[in-house]
């Protein structure tokens, strides 16, 4: 099944995808699409690159903010809404016969939660999930670097939520 990534409504979502250009600088076409990777290309394309640069974006909210020329084609979706939830396909279209690399990732967009944990738990939360659970006061997570995001799945989030609840923290869905 797909790796899941979580973002709050109004924040930026980061969906990692990368390849190693061989030789360095020898870029290949990449597409990002909403929906699992089909047999060919991407379905419902949101962003596409050619051998040089991004040449197609369906919205100004979709960006490649990593080092595209080194093969970091991670997708940033700005100001996410609940409608952005779902599976996304990153397809690296390596030339040749049936050489594509396909990566399906799942974005889970959650409503902002008001968390008022004990101070120690607040510190633990921030250090354990520096970019995953952000509140409006921190602003969009635009400064994240590839690889800095922990691979947090829903199970981990639910476990964290239960720990907060057990500690007496109040959690309210906005």
């Amino acid at each position: 099944s797909e790796v899941e990534y979580i973002a709050e409504v109004g924040q930026n979502a980061y969906l990692p995808c990368s390849y190693t250009p061989a030789p360095p600088g020898n870029l290949v076409p990449v597409c990002w699409g909403k929906g699992a990777c089909p047999v060919f290309d991407c379905s419902n394309v949101v962003l596409r690159t050619d051998n040089r640069d991004v040449n197609d974006r369906t919205s100004g909210r979709y960006w490649l903010k990593g080092d595209f020329h080194k093969g970091d084609v991670s997708l940033t979706i700005e100001n996410v809404t609940l409608a952005d939830s779902g599976v996304y396909c990153c397809r690296i279209q390596i030339p040749g016969i049936m050489n594509d690399e396909k990566h399906n990732v799942k974005l889970v967009v959650i409503k902002p939660a008001k968390v008022t944990p004990a101070p120690t738990l607040q510190r633990d939360l921030t250090s354990a999930f520096p970019r995953m659970l952000t509140t409006g006061e921190h602003g969009p997570a635009e400064t994240q670097t590839p690889g800095s995001l922990p691979d947090v799945n829903l199970t981990q989030i639910f476990t964290l939520t239960n720990e907060l609840r057990d500690s007496g923290a109040t959690i309210r869905t906005a």
């Epitope: 929906g35 089909p38 279209q93 016969i97």
Partner: antibody, heavy 116, light 108 residues
Framework: EVQLLESGGGLVQPGGSLRLSCAAS????????MHWVRQAPGKGLEWVSA????????YYADSVKGRFTISRDNSKNTLYLQMNSLRAEDTAVYYC?????????WGQGTLVTVSS | EIVLTQSPGTLSLSPGERATLSCRAS???????LAWYQQKPGQAPRLLIY???SRATGIPDRFSGSGSGTDFTLTISRLEPEDFAVYYC?????????FGQGTKVEIK
Amino acid sequence: EVQLLESGGGLVQPGGSLRLSCAASGFTFSGYWMHWVRQAPGKGLEWVSAISYSGSSTYYADSVKGRFTISRDNSKNTLYLQMNSLRAEDTAVYYCAKGTNWLDYWGQGTLVTVSS
Amino acid sequence: EIVLTQSPGTLSLSPGERATLSCRASQSVSSSYLAWYQQKPGQAPRLLIYGASSRATGIPDRFSGSGSGTDFTLTISRLEPEDFAVYYCQQYGSSPLTFGQGTKVEIK
């Protein structure tokens, strides 16, 4: 109006070769994936091969891999299928079709008969 | 590969009747990546439905598609004389592209 016109079919002996062409018009050829699909007499449809916009990526059914080669010339708006080491079971009408994963326009097909 | 099994093999109906064609996949078709085509004798196939339920350009609204997972249906709400043909389903969720064996809709 989108038009796809296949040519190059005919009678060929087992082990022989044939090159099919598909002339496209009415759309921006270089902006679309293209496919070959075949249909044996009285049978159903079988996907054969596909090629990406630029021609840099190609895909084949296991039944033709290593024997058939798909290519395109975007300057001539033409799709090709080079068929080598032909077998009796390759006998079919060969259609070229436009589209990525679903095929929204098809040519009328060209008949390839492999027989001694 | 995903095997698509269409049923019935032949459907004998009269003009004006409702036709229900089934396409069952050997494993789940991701994201409802399924298309339907119509083929008349001596003609090329014609795309009717993609994405399991989206009608292709120019297709009359008497044609509708539904389903997800492994079970998909093409419905022709009221058969017109020109609808008697062979219908194929095709999946594009898993390599390679595969087609069903077809359902023939014939005049009763």
